[in-house]
Each structure stands twice: as structure tokens, then as C-alpha cells.
């Protein structure tokens, strides 16, 4: 609460996160023209990336384009991309939606459709829907440990959210354990009124707000965090503004002296830890 | 404008960026002693990296050191690094400018020059100039979509820069479309009074400032962002303070059971999105 | 100092860091059943990662699990993980401490111990102590150049920590050179009253605070940074809250058409650069 006689100072904060959990992923795998069900295990090194403290990312879904090579090929026949003659294809043109640079030729994509030939990583990425349900939907049961160190330099005061008395096997609960800093990802979504299973398909951004309202006067000292959760991406966003949260990354390798890559379009939840608040002292 | 009767609160912000564009790169490629012109395509997975929301990086130039192996070799004969006898080479010495640890021997680098032998990733990186013009100079035409969600917790008010009425095929323009949040990289530089083609060679840091001056009183409500741009790195910086913006990363692989790496010195533009402002309410 | 007649404004900041240094690492390497001493060189591309400006990471220690493959194997026999019959193993169970999903079978780990079989990256990671002393303990002698650009938009004032008069071969010292922005990592720890050699084993988080207390009135203008250092992770933290600083990442590759990975558990120092302060003007 506002104490007008106090000198207020904004919080200086540092965050460290640690995600735990394993996901079993079942998906169709095609090898040598034969499609069969493949099972694989994803651990933290597979689904998360070494990011800064105030953000962490958990991959919940993906689409792979394997064995791409830099060459010429027909572009993917998305809406409005088909052609019937070379006139429709403009040499040197880069359509922002396309994945390559047009050669000027209209070539067969398959037995019924023709598209403009492009210089690109081939075969070009198919614009297919993200798998539903999400491949790593079980990430709902992952947990994240959040360590937050705060400082009010003007008041020469430092503290952290984890106290020596805390129990490392706790799980945050708004009522039963509001000071525990180990959070189940599904619980974060539930608290924010969101459906993890749904968001996991396209990805999204979730805010974990840590509010420090600190009274640093010795006679009524109080300085503990309050956690709250809210979704940061716009779930009603128009297709043209890229709803959800995804990014592409590549694994490069050489095969028979040919430079190749596997392109991964990773969908997931980016968790932003937003620390704010003030320290007041007479 | 300052309304002294209002309670002001700083903005809490989350940012999500999405870069689009393809670059065609033409460079000399040497294979089996033969040098020829090579063309390659770079898409987002090749020139950008999965970074936090409030920063994104676009590679505009690079220098590659291919096929490096951990062994002994002469160090690169940069200014002041040549030797004529072993006396000039100190076993165990690590020159901060060098790329390895000296063995104490002075050995031939080529038919005219001798340098200290080092234990390093060999052959050591040549200290050659960044290519001019920049290899991905066409990144000037890339676009970035910036999504910004803001929150004034004390006023329990949340909004974002993208409104449902906005058109996903717009491009930001200071006069004609100042609320569009899709920016052409070249335009950002032009607005900041900088030359993209020039900066792309050595790299640099560009600030995209998003200023929210929000009046949250119902009778005169206003809360929309204002975008401005300024260069953050010092273009007049002394050589010793590492002008521009670059970093090195490596791709590791095994060949005939020997651990090798390709070292990439990536030059580019780091864009920092700096969100600030206040929300005022009676 | 507080000048009550001034209009105060918080700092808007952008940071760029550049780490320099080479480490020689000596460790036991096992090949074809033979263990011998291996020497390797680590340069910036090996021990640091392209991170955002306000944080950088230096790897000081690591544990490798080489040649992992997705298959079935006995889990690591950590405390409480051994079994004597299948009853102790629950099909489909994922122990947060384990690295895989149990099949329900109790199988031999070695000639004396049995553990639950898991579907995982095999062989599973051994829970061994981080090497002591730290493998890259010589990182104490690495240096980091910190460039900080600040802005007070309300006062239309911009400056940076590096001035044209500065010498690029300086090293920060609290007394002799408090404005030099090149810091020896060991000195940062010494200033913070911490032992680099000790922290390097398990990793940690170190804060570099840059305080700008700017008087922008022309008649008594002052705007230079003050650097201070403090450890941000809790060195007395209970084991259950994951002391130190580490993360796992993987290098994936194919061998005889089998997808494999090398898992690296990287321990190191994350340096957080915390910029704060105000600009005051009449």
C-alpha cells in the first residue's frame, strides 16, 4: 500500500530458471518410402534452449523438413502460387511467402499442379498445419524452478524468492503454497485461464509476473514476492500477424560431400518472467 | 504531457519479433584448389538465431574458417606477430590477440614469413577484412513484425500495439502508416539517418524505441505506441574497442574420426527493442 | 545526490559485451577402452554462446555423455533408484530425477546392481560430480569488454560508457582505472568478495551493476557510470534447489545411419549486466 512518507525505489532483478521433465513423442516416420510409428524421448536438451534468465522456451510441437539441399525445385503450391506458363514466374523475384528466388520457369510440382521454380533449400518447406494434438503435449506436466534475486541499491537491500526454510519438493499453489517457486506448466496456464493442450499446438507467450511490494522500514518490514500469470500473445490474432509462437532453426550436416540441413519449425511456449515492484523506506 | 494530478506507473512490457526475407549470396568458393563463383540462398533459419523477444539479430556478413582441427600450427602473421627465432616465442603464452597457446617454437608460416607455433584450432583464423559490399546486403529489404504487449499492473490495464483493425500487409511509415508494426529494415536505418549498406559490412546495433504515453482516464483515454529509431553502437569507435557488431560461433563435425569445426565470424545488426513510458490515471 | 527541484527520469539502456581469452583444458579421454590425458584449446566460439546484450555466459566446467542413442537401457543407479524385481518399476512412469520413461522391467546395471529399465537417450547420463578443479579454471584470466549506451528520452540526452579518450588496452581497477570498461573476470569476483576457482566448479551468477546518476543541468553537468559487482546466485542453497549455474545442450549427429547425440552439461558463470540510475534536470 502507498506510504507517502517513504522514499520509493524500483526493483533491480536477476532471474534464473530450470525446467524439468521428459516427453514421449509418437509420430509417423517415413524411411525408404515406408511409413511407420516412431517413438522418441525428449529431455531438456531436446526441447529447450539456453536462453537468458528472464525468458525460457519450451518446445511443444514441431514440423520437420529433412534433407534439404541448396538447388532448384518447384515451390510449394500454396494458395495463389500455381502457374500454367513461364509468364507467371518472374526471374529474380522473392515472394515474401515463398522460400526461394524464382528462376522464371513454371515447372511440375506433382502430376496435377505446376508452380514457379525457385532457387532455394529444396524440397521447400510444406506449409502444413502444426500437428494436432501437439507432439509434446505432455509438457503440461513439466516443472520450472524460478530463482529471483532482487536488489534495491538505494536502500542497500538484497533478497531472493527462495528462503533457506523452503522445501525443494514443493509445487506452487495459489492457496496452499503461494511462496513455492517450483511451478507446473499446466498450473500456470490454469491460473491464467488458458488451455495448455490448445496453446501447445501453435505456441504462445505466457507471462509470469513477480511483484515485490517491499516495506523496508525495520518496524514493519515485509518483502516477499507475489506471483501471477497472464497470457501475453493475442489468441484472437489475424492469420497475417502470425498467431501463436514459433521459430525456425536448422541442423546442418554433410552427406556424400553435399551440404544438407534439417529445418525445424518449432512451436512452443515462451515464458516471460516480468519482475516489478518497489522498495519503500522512511 | 505531464498531468500532475495523475498517479503515474511505468510500463511492463513483453515483445515478440518475426523476421521475414530471403537473401541470395554470391561469393568465391574454393574446392579442390579451384575457385569459382558460388550462389546460395539464406532464409531466416540461416541468418537469424532464436533470441529473446526484446532483441533480434540479422546476419549481414560473415567470414568462414573451414575445416579447423585441434593441433599445432603457425599463428596468423598479423602486425607484430612475426618472429625470426624461438627466443621471440614464449612457451605457454597466450596473446589475447592470438588464437592459441604458444609452444615456444618459431616456424615458417609461408615462404617469406615465420610466426610462433601455437596449439590451437588450425589453420588459425585469418584476420581478413569483412567482405565489402556485405554478403547479405539485400537484408535491407527484410521486414520485421514487432508484437508488443504492455501492462500497467497498478491500473490493471493491458493493451498491445497490434489492433484487430490493422492490416497485415502494411509497412510502417512515419507519416502514412505510423501505427503499422511491420518494419522494413532499410527504412529503420533511413529513419535513424544511417546507411544500411555501410553498417551491414561490420555490423552494428540499432535501437527501436517504443514509447507508450498513456492517459488511462476514461474521459480522455489515449494509449497508442510511438516508434522511433536510433543507432546504439558508436560508429566512430576506436579499433581497440571492437567497432561494429560481430560474434564467432562454430559448427562441429567429425570427418574420418577427426573432430573438426567450421568457425563463422558473423557480422550483423542487433536490433534492441526498448519499450518505455508511463500510464497515468486520476 | 537528490536534487528535489529536478525532473528525474529512469535510464533506457543497451549493452554489448565481447569476451576474450583462450583456455587450455587437460582431461582424461577414453578411446577404444584406453584412457589417456587429452589436451584441448577452448576459444570464445567453444566456451561462450551468442546471447543478448545484458547477459553473457562463460563455460568454466562440463560433463559430457558421448554417443547417446534413443533405445532401452538401465537407468543410472543414483540413491534410491535400485530395484530387485519388476514390482519396483512402473511402466510409463517418469521420475523427475530420471532421464527416461520406465518400461516396467528391473534389469542389471552392472554385475552388482539392478535398476529400472527406461526408454531414453542411452547410456543415460551418469550423475557424477562436476570436475574439481574446474576444467576451464583459467577463464579467471579472460576479459570482457562492456559497451553501454544510455538514453534519457524525456531529456533528449544520450551518452555511452566508452569515451573517445579511453585506452583500449586498459583493465578496470576500482581505484586506478574506475572508468575502464574492460574487466578481468577474476577481478570481478575479487571485487565481489568471491573465489573464482571455487565458483567455476558448479557455476554461478555474477551481477555487474552499472549505475548512472546523471545531473543534466548545464551548470553542473555530470554523467559517468559507476561499476559494482555482486554475486546473484545463493551459494548456500539447498541441493534440492539446484545450486550453481548449469544447463544441458546437445550436439546431434548421424553414425551408420543412427541418430546420436553428445550431451554436454555445461557449468559456468552467467554475468548479468544490471544498468540503472536516473537523469535529473531542472
Amino acid at each position: 500500500s502507498d506510504k507517502l512518507y517513504q522514499r520509493k525505489e524500483p526493483v533491480i532483478s536477476s532471474v534464473h530458471t530450470k525446467v524439468k521433465g521428459i516427453a514421449e513423442v509418437t509420430e509417423n516416420v517415413t524411411e525408404g518410402g515406408v511409413t511407420k510409428l516412431g517413438h522418441s524421448i525428449f529431455d531438456t536438451a531436446d526441447y529447450t534452449f539456453p536462453l537468458q534468465g528472464n525468458s525460457f522456451f519450451v518446445m511443444t510441437n514441431y514440423v520437420k523438413s529433412e534433407g534439404q539441399v541448396q538447388t532448384l525445385c518447384p515451390e510449394y503450391p500454396r494458395r495463389g502460387a500455381q502457374c500454367s506458363s513461364d509468364r507467371r514466374c518472374k526471374k529474380g523475384w522473392m515472394d515474401p511467402q515463398s522460400k526461394g528466388i524464382q528462376t522464371g520457369r513454371c515447372v511440375p510440382y506433382d502430376k496435377t499442379r505446376k508452380t514457379c521454380e525457385v532457387s532455394a533449400w529444396c524440397p521447400t518447406e510444406e506449409e502444413k498445419e502444426a500437428p494436432r494434438p501437439a507432439l509434446l503435449r505432455s509438457a503440461e506436466n513439466f516443472t520450472v524452478l524460478i530463482k529471483n534475486n532482487i536488489h534495491f541499491p538505494g536502500h542497500n537491500y538484497t533478497t531472493r524468492n527462495i528462503l533457506p526454510t523452503m522445501n525443494g519438493s514443493c509445487t506452487f499453489h495459489k492457496t496452499w503454497d503461494p511462496q513455492c517457486s517450483i511451478f507446473r506448466l499446466g498450473d500456470i496456464f490454469q491460473e491464467a485461464g488458458e488451455n495448455f493442450t490448445e496453446v501447445a499446438v501453435q505456441g504462445g507467450i505466457m507471462g509470469i509476473e513477480i511483484y515485490w511490494d517491499c516495506n523496508l522500514d525495520s518496524w514493519s518490514h515485509h518483502c516477499r514476492p507475489r506471483y501471477s500469470f497472464r497470457r501475453l500473445d493475442d489468441k484472437n490474432m489475424d492469420e497475417s500477424f502470425v498467431p501463436g509462437y514459433n521459430f525456425r532453426y536448422a541442423k546442418y550436416y554433410k552427406e556424400n560431400n553435399v551440404e544438407k540441413r534439417t529445418l525445424i519449425k518449432a512451436f512452443g511456449i515462451r515464458f516471460d518472467i516480468l519482475v516489478f515492484g518497489t522498495g519503500g523506506k522512511f | 504531457s505531464d498531468k500532475l494530478y495523475q498517479r503515474k506507473e511505468p510500463v511492463i512490457s513483453s515483445v515478440h519479433t518475426k523476421v521475414k526475407g530471403i537473401a541470395e549470396v554470391t561469393e568465391n568458393v574454393t574446392e579442390g584448389g579451384v575457385t569459382k563463383l558460388g550462389h546460395s540462398i539464406f532464409d531466416t533459419a540461416d541468418y537469424t538465431f532464436p533470441l529473446q523477444g526484446n532483441s533480434f539479430f540479422v546476419m549481414t556478413n560473415y567470414v568462414k574458417s573451414e575445416g579447423q582441427v585441434q593441433t599445432l600450427c603457425p599463428e596468423y602473421p598479423r602486425r607484430g606477430a612475426q618472429c625470426s627465432s624461438d627466443r621471440r616465442c614464449k612457451k605457454g603464452w597466450m596473446d589475447p590477440q592470438s588464437k592459441g597457446i604458444q609452444t615456444g617454437r618459431c616456424v615458417p608460416y609461408d615462404k617469406t614469413r615465420k610466426t610462433c607455433e601455437v596449439s590451437a584450432w588450425c589453420p588459425t583464423e585469418e584476420e581478413k577484412e569483412a567482405p565489402r559490399p556485405a554478403l547479405l546486403r539485400s537484408a535491407e529489404n527484410f521486414t520485421v513484425l514487432i508484437k508488443n504487449n504492455i501492462h500497467f499492473p497498478g491500473h490493471n490495464y493491458t493493451t498491445r500495439n497490434i489492433l484487430p483493425t490493422m492490416n497485415g500487409s502494411c509497412t510502417f511509415h512515419k507519416t502514412w502508416d505510423p501505427q503499422c508494426s511491420i518494419f522494413r529494415l532499410g527504412d529503420i536505418f533511413q529513419e535513424a539517418g544511417e546507411n544500411f549498406t555501410e553498417v551491414a559490412v561490420q555490423g552494428g546495433i540499432m535501437g527501436i524505441e517504443i514509447y507508450w504515453d498513456c492517459n488511462l482516464d476514461s474521459w480522455s483515454h489515449h494509449c497508442r505506441p510511438r516508434y522511433s529509431f536510433r543507432r546504439l553502437d558508436d560508429k566512430n569507435m576506436d579499433e581497440s574497442f571492437v567497432p561494429g557488431y560481430n560474434f564467432r560461433y562454430a559448427k562441429y563435425y567429425k570427418e574420418n574420426n577427426v573432430e573438426k569445426r567450421t568457425l563463422i565470424k558473423a557480422f550483423g545488426i542487433r536490433f534492441d527493442i526498448l519499450v518505455f513510458g508511463t500510464g497515468g490515471k486520476f | 545526490s537528490d536534487k528535489l527541484y529536478q525532473r528525474k527520469e529512469p535510464v533506457i539502456s543497451s549493452v554489448h559485451t565481447k569476451v576474450k581469452g583462450i583456455a587450455e583444458v587437460t582431461e582424461n579421454v577414453t578411446e577404444g577402452g584406453v584412457t589417456k590425458l587429452g589436451h584441448s584449446i577452448f576459444d570464445t566460439a567453444d566456451y561462450t554462446f551468442p546471447l543478448q546484450g545484458n547477459s553473457f555466459f562463460v563455460m568454466t566446467n562440463y560433463v559430457k555423455s558421448e554417443g547417446q542413442v534413443q533405445t532401452l537401457c538401465p537407468e543410472y543407479p543414483r540413491r534410491g533408484a535400485q530395484c530387485s524385481s519388476d514390482r519396483r518399476c512402473k511402466k510409463g512412469w517418469m521420475d523427475p530425477q530420471s532421464k527416461g520413461i520406465q518400461t516396467g522391467r528391473c534389469v542389471p546395471y552392472d554385475k552388482t546392481r539392478k535398476t529400472c529399465e527406461v526408454s531414453a537417450w542411452c547410456p543415460t547420463e551418469e550423475e557424477k560430480e562436476a570436475p574439481r578443479p574446474a576444467l576451464l579454471r583459467s577463464a579467471e584470466n579472460f576479459t570482457v569488454l562492456i559497451k553501454n549506451n544510455i538514453h534519457f528520452p524525456g531529456h533528449n540526452y544520450t551518452t555511452r560508457n566508452i569515451l573517445p579518450t579511453m585506452n583500449g588496452s586498459c583493465t578496470f581497477h576500482k581505484t586506478w582505472d574506475p572508468q575502464c570498461s574492460i574487466f578481468r573476470l577474476g577481478d570481478i569476483f575479487q571485487e565481489a568478495g568471491e573465489n573464482f576457482t571455487e565458483v567455476a566448479v558448479q557455476g554461478g551468477i555474477m551481477g555487474i551493476e552499472i549505475y548512472w546518476d546523471c545531473n543534466l543541468d548545464s551548470w553542473s553537468h555530470h554523467c559517468r557510470p559507476r561499476y559494482s559487482f555482486r554475486r546473484l546466485d545463493d551459494k548456500n542453497m539447498d541441493e534440492s534447489f539446484v545450486p550453481g549455474y548449469n544447463f544441458r545442450y546437445a550436439k546431434y549427429y548421424k553414425e551408420n545411419n543412427v541418430e546420436k547425440r553428445t550431451l554436454i552439461k555445461a557449468f559456468g558463470i552467467r554475468f548479468d549486466i544490471l544498468v540503472f540510475g536516473t537523469g535529473g534536470k531542472f
Partner: nanobody, 115 residues
Framework: EVQLVESGGGLVQAGGSLRLSCAAS?????MGWFRQAPGKEREFVAG????????RYADSVKGRFTISRDNAKNTVSLQMSGLKPEDTAIYYC???????????WGQGTQVTVSS
């Protein structure tokens, strides 16, 4: 699924020539040839994009083999000259989405080069 029929294989002496042909049941962007020698893995020989652009050859056949195709007829040919005993293999026609990527293979035709 694309049907592919190869022809033109046979026995030839070292240094001799042979022409392989292949007809596809439908048009496709790229057509190419692979081969498999006894006890070895199938390997790429030559490939052609639409209208013969681009073409790609394995290092071992460069300068000796020439690939050509007729888009109108959905056919591809491989003219082999300067044949060596190590060229002995079953040769397969293939179609795909680029000169590096093939999805469908024919039944194969035997080529034997005697010394």
C-alpha cells in the same frame, strides 16, 4: 504412385558404350539414375531437373556419362561411354522433387562391363 520402366541394359566390353532409357507414367520435376553393385549400397549416378536444368553427376561418372530428358514424353536417358568394370551394377531410374531428392524407383536394368 509414379510407375517407371527402364530399358537398354546389357553386357558390354570395357571402353564400350551403352544407352539406358526410362519412361515415367506421369510428369515429374526431376528424373535421374542410381545404381547398386553387388554387396554395395545404392548410389546416385546422374540427375536432371525440368528441361535438363540443372544436371548433376556423381564424381565417378563425370565426363563419361550424359543425362538427357524429354519432358513431353516423360522420359530420361543415360548415355554411358568409356565404361569400366566398376560400372557393373543394376541401374535404377528415379523421379523426385529436385536433383538431390528422389521418391520413386523403377525395377532396374542390369549393366555388366567385362574386362
Amino acid at each position: 504412385e509414379v510407375q517407371l520402366v527402364e530399358s537398354g541394359g546389357g553386357l558390354v566390353q570395357a571402353g564400350g558404350s551403352l544407352r539406358l532409357s526410362c519412361a515415367a507414367s506421369e510428369r515429374t520435376y526431376s528424373m535421374g539414375w542410381f545404381r547398386q553393385a553387388p554387396g554395395k549400397e545404392r548410389e546416385f549416378v546422374a540427375g536432371s531437373g525440368w528441361d535438363g536444368i540443372p544436371t548433376r553427376y556423381a564424381d565417378s561418372v563425370k565426363g563419361r556419362f550424359t543425362i538427357s530428358r524429354d519432358n513431353a514424353k516423360n522420359t530420361v536417358s543415360l548415355q554411358m561411354s568409356g565404361l569400366k568394370p566398376e560400372d557393373t551394377a543394376i541401374y535404377y531410374c528415379a523421379t523426385g522433387t529436385s536433383v538431390y531428392h528422389y521418391q520413386y524407383w523403377g525395377q532396374g536394368t542390369q549393366v555388366t562391363v567385362s574386362s
